[in-house]
């Protein structure tokens, strides 16, 4: 028997520095977690103790904090190189800055293979990107070889900016021939490493003949055997065992997100490459694990540029950006409009001639808007200003909801109106009229939504049985502020870009902004 230790991360999302327990900015260092300096310590410890160790990343290193905003992926290459990763799969967010923003900072600089079998380049890009990412890689490990085959969510064109010269194929269809190829090369230990979410990970384990282990990402799935060490609730045991169609037991793993845990899986193979046993657990990277001093010093060196960036002007406003709770928790506020407009702008993807865009709607809890921005400071808007407006380090995500769920959400928005509560919704691509004289749960008297399947966008009444795409904060997608109906009834949820980054990019693009209060939210006569 031959034993392999797989260490794995996924959906790190730019958390190079240690974070608080909820993966936001570290405040009390003695209780902070994760970060590359701490990860390095644990990885080195395991490498010293065990012979056959692979360190793998299942994608979405890009996007999530000011680190990515400023360094644009160079930080990912540098610190992953320092940790001596053995392979990485491409995630959807690796395309957030377009193909060039992947090629230059990461693909050309990584000292480890970057993989995806179901992304095929065409046209002029094919020669430019040739060899920079691979469908699979055979890695020598000790006296054996292990095949790693990569995959990426085929939804990436709707979630990011891969452009028109990359085709995202069905994962299972694309993986099978690559695994077959590895078999013909006498590689009998094969790991599928990828970024399509836990459901697809399980399907790959079930359907792709020859895959021995699946290491996944995208869905931020936390798996654990025994008593979990922090706040995350396990979605199943670690590893999650799937019985393949050809009768094999295939371990499937994922390690939550944000570098909070290091996945740790031990696999025992027989001489024919069959998995005999698999066991392990994610390791919580808490403060009991010291941060490596060399990496920490380097992080501090790289940090200097971030501090300078946060005070630079992104753009100007010529109007007061009303982000006060007195406005945003009671009525349409122009800060809410600005943020929603930025959220939609960030999700412009012309992927189908029938649609002007795949999504037109935005909802945003008023309680998530934490500060106004005064235009009388020469109109200057900085990252620092935006961090005061959006201090929680969330993301703006894409969900699919039925019209009936949206109607419930808008009823919830005003079910206890007048108490300055955070659930009052700011909107984009939506016209809502409330009648507060009616009883809670029956106050939405008009709800019109902007069409997507149209050449000239216009507002149509919401249809209860239709499925709509909506951009919203991850906080709402997870049921925050009492929006349990969104969490319970959403049909799909894909995590998006860092909230501040979305707004800052929009402001930089527009240069001068002047958002108005324009009748997106109305109250029917006599009730307000």
């Amino acid at each position: 028997a031959w034993e392999l230790t797989i260490l794995h991360t996924n959906d790190v999302h730019s958390r190079l520095e240690q974070t608080s327990e909820d993966s936001s900015k570290c405040v009390n260092a003695s209780r902070c977690m994760g970060g590359v300096a701490r990860l390095f310590t644990k990885v080195q410890q395991i490498r010293r103790a065990e012979p056959n160790v692979l360190l793998l990343d299942a994608g979405d290193q890009y996007q999530g904090t000011i680190w990515f905003t400023v360094y644009k992926g160079a930080e990912v290459a540098h610190f992953m190189n320092a940790l001596r990763y053995d392979a990485m799969a491409l995630g959807n967010h690796e395309f957030d800055n377009g193909v060039e923003g992947l090629i230059e900072p990461l693909l050309k600089e990584a000292k480890f293979p970057i993989l995806s079998a179901n992304i095929k380049a065409k046209g002029p890009l094919a020669s430019q990107i040739s060899g920079l990412y691979l469908p699979y890689k055979v890695l020598p490990v000790g006296d054996e070889v292990v095949g790693i085959v990569g995959y990426t969510s085929k939804e990436t064109p709707f979630l990011s900016n891969p452009g028109t010269n990359l085709v995202f194929e069905d994962e299972i269809t694309a993986l099978q021939p690559e695994v077959d190829k590895l078999k013909t090369l006498n590689v009998n230990k094969i790991i599928a490493l990828g970024h399509s979410g836990f459901e697809m990970d399980k399907l790959i384990a079930q359907k792709v003949r020859g895959v021995d282990v699946v290491v996944g990402g995208h869905s931020n799935t936390f798996l654990y055997t025994g008593n979990p060490p922090s706040k995350e609730v396990p979605a199943g045991k670690y590893p999650f065992i799937v019985t393949s169609d050809d009768g094999r037991k295939v371990p499937v793993v994922q390690a939550y997100a944000f570098g909070k845990y290091l996945g740790y899986l031990k696999i025992e193979f027989d001489e024919r490459g069959n998995v005999i046993s698999s066991h392990g657990n994610p390791i919580l990277l808490n403060s009991s694990i010291p941060e490596d001093p060399s990496i920490k010093a380097d992080i501090n060196k790289w940090r200097i540029k971030l501090d300078n960036y946060s005070t630079q002007e992104l753009g100007k406003t010529i109007v007061y950006l009303d982000g006060s709770s007195q406005s945003c928790r009671f009525r349409e506020c122009n800060m809410g409009n600005l943020i929603c407009d930025a959220m939609i702008n960030n999700n412009l993807r012309h992927t189908d001639e029938m649609f002007w865009n795949h999504v037109s709607m935005c909802i945003l809890n008023g309680g998530g808007i934490r500060s106004p921005i005064d235009e009388r400071n020469n109109g200057t808007i900085t990252w620092e200003n935006l961090a005061a407006v959006l201090p929680f380090g969330g993301t703006f995500d894409l969900v699919q909801l039925k019209g009936s769920t949206l109607k419930k959400a808008f009823e919830h928005s005003v079910h206890r109106y007048g108490q300055s509560t955070g659930e009052f919704l700011q909107v984009g691509g939506i016209h809502v009229v409330y009648d507060l004289s009616r009883k809670p749960g029956d106050r939405v008297v008009k709800l019109d939504v902007l069409c997507t399947k149209c050449r000239v966008p216009s507002y149509d009444p919401l249809k209860m049985d239709e499925v709509y795409k909506v951009i919203l904060p991850n906080f709402l997608a997870n049921g925050g502020d009492g929006f349990q109906m969104i969490k319970d009834e959403l049909l799909r949820h894909d995590s998006g870009d860092q909230d501040i980054n979305v707004v800052s990019t929009y402001i930089s693009k527009m240069k001068v902004i002047y958002p108005a209060v324009e009748g997106r939210i109305k109250f029917s006569t006599g009730s307000h």
Epitope: Q44, R47, R48, P51, N52, V53, L54, A74, H78, N81, A82, R84, D86, K108, E109, K111, L139, P140, V141, G142, D143, S294, I295, D298
Partner: antibody
Framework: QVQLVQSGAEVKKPGASVKMSCKAS????????MHWVKQSHGKSLEWIGY????????TYNPKFEGRATLTVDTSASTAYMELRSLRSEDTAVYYC????????????WGQGTTVTVSS | DIVMTQSPSSLSASVGDRVTITCTAS???????LHWYQQKPGSSPKLWIY???NLASGVPGRFSGSGSGTDYTLTISSLQPEDFATYYC?????????FGAGTKLEIK
């Protein structure tokens, strides 16, 4: 102190193979990558490739891929390079070199192994 | 591959002279991954300057390094007898790792 001690000079015939060693001491062997560099007489330095001692993962300069093989024995803190199908232009000094993990500079060099290929 | 071109290939100078050696990369290199080595006859190369401008341990302060993008320099403010050697620049910004052809510093 940190040092790399390489095996002695070798004289080989064209077509033969040579395997040289590099014994590391003064640091944790698995913590740093080990590179190999060729220097022909009076010439510049040419990178052959490197190995990650903790799992024997290798990366080669395409020019040497297929002809050079890097291995390690972690229990002996020793790295090896085998060069096959030797030809006269392989006559050179070969250095094993430790690299920094952050900026990948070569901070510790072996004393070199001289290989002479001659019929 | 990134080609590193050093100039001059050799240089005769006197003790006390100020000397500058340049290294030009065929495409842009991050200054963090540009390093210099000193080699004397019969010895292994020694790390001399790392990440463009940081002197390795034991390297005298008369040495300095600078540059960005494709152009890098090593400067000796006042040449001393022990500085006569060959200097190599090196990049590992992108694979494969490459060296310059070297600049041989000789006594005039």
């Amino acid at each position: 102190q940190v040092q790399l001690v390489q095996s002695g000079a070798e004289v080989k015939k064209p077509g033969a193979s040579v395997k040289m060693s590099c014994k590391a001491s003064g640091y944790t062997f698995t913590d740093y990558n080990m590179h190999w560099v060729k220097q022909s007489h009076g010439k510049s330095l040419e990178w052959i490739g490197y190995i990650k001692p903790h799992n024997a993962g290798t990366t080669y300069n395409p020019k040497f891929e297929g002809r050079a093989t890097l291995t390690v024995d972690t229990s002996a803190s020793t790295a090896y390079m085998e060069l096959r199908s030797l030809r006269s232009e392989d006559t050179a000094v070969y250095y094993c070199v430790r690299s920094d993990f952050l900026y990948w500079y070569f901070d510790v060099w072996g004393q070199g192994t001289t290989v002479t290929v001659s019929s | 591959d990134i080609v590193m071109t050093q100039s001059p290939s050799s240089l005769s100078a006197s003790v006390g002279d100020r000397v500058t050696i340049t290294c030009t990369a065929s495409s842009s290199v991050s200054s963090s991954y540009l390093h210099w080595y000193q080699q004397k006859p019969g010895s292994s190369p020694k790390l001399w300057i790392y990440s463009t401008s940081n002197l390795a341990s034991g390297v005298p302060g008369r040495f300095s390094g600078s540059g960005s993008g494709t152009d890098y320099t090593l400067t000796i403010s006042s040449l001393q007898p022990e500085d006569f050697a060959t200097y190599y620049c090196h990049q590992y910004h992108r694979s494969p790792l490459t060296f310059g052809a070297g600049t041989k510093l000789e006594i005039k």
